[in-house]
């Protein structure tokens, strides 16, 4: 049933490259779960900008993802 | 960089039908692109009008405002790197500039919002006269 996970993933199409630094407020990952089958990188922009996906296979997403995998464990 | 160009709007009776076209200057990931049309009536805010996007696999995904539903469709030729909003039955309340808007990163609940979208066309005014 992969088309139905992904179907539920909060991201779609596959995210931005890179989100300038200095416009994140925070950094959330989603990682697969039974509603979605692939890890998401949330950005939540400064001043109510929205929120943009960043491409998990991006060189920043790797970044962010390890960063906060540090500060976890 | 994505520019986009609208066209297609013009004048037309109500009950009368157009196709709008956003036109992507620069394609590269127009495939994947999550493809939206608003629009903005005078004195009003922009609202969502219709959201097409990718579902990871061969097929599209759309989503539409209730006012539109069953009237307009959302579609897209990747190999022109063109989207379309087909425009049935329309009302003098249709009456905007309608605009054309894309985004690699949208996040699914928040497609309706014009903050979630990177790229922005100039619009296009469509006139419904009664």
């Known amino acids: 049933f992969p088309m139905f996970k992904r179907g539920r993933c909060l991201c779609i199409g596959p995210g931005v490259k890179a989100v300038k630094v200095a416009d994140i407020e925070k950094a959330s990952i989603m990682y697969p779960s039974n509603n979605c089958d692939k890890i998401e990188v949330i950005i939540t922009l400064k001043e109510n900008k929205g929120q943009r996906c960043l491409n998990p296979k991006s060189k920043q997403a790797r970044l962010i993802i390890k960063k906060v995998e540090r500060k976890n464990f | 960089e994505v520019q986009l160009v609208e066209s297609g709007g013009g004048l037309v009776q109500a009950g009368g039908s157009l196709r709008l076209s956003c036109a992507a200057a620069?394609?590269?990931?127009?495939?994947?692109?999550?493809i939206s049309w608003f629009r903005q009536a005078p004195g009003k805010d922009r609202e969502f009008v219709a959201a097409?996007?990718?579902?990871?696999?061969?097929?599209?995904?759309?989503e539409y405002a209730d006012s539109v539903k069953g009237r307009f469709t959302i579609s897209r030729d990747n190999a022109k790197n063109t989207a379309y909003l087909e425009m049935n039955s329309l009302k003098f309340e249709d009456t905007a500039v309608y605009y054309c808007?894309?985004?690699?990163?949208?996040?699914?609940?928040?497609?309706?919002?014009?903050?979630?979208?990177?790229?922005w066309g100039q619009g296009t005014q469509v006139t419904v006269s009664s």
């Open positions: 808007a894309a985004g690699l990163g949208v996040v699914r609940t928040l497609i309706r919002r014009a903050s979630s979208y990177d790229y």
């Open positions: 620069s394609g590269g990931t127009f495939t994947k692109q999550t």
């Open positions: 097409q996007w990718w579902s990871g696999l061969s097929t599209y995904f759309a």
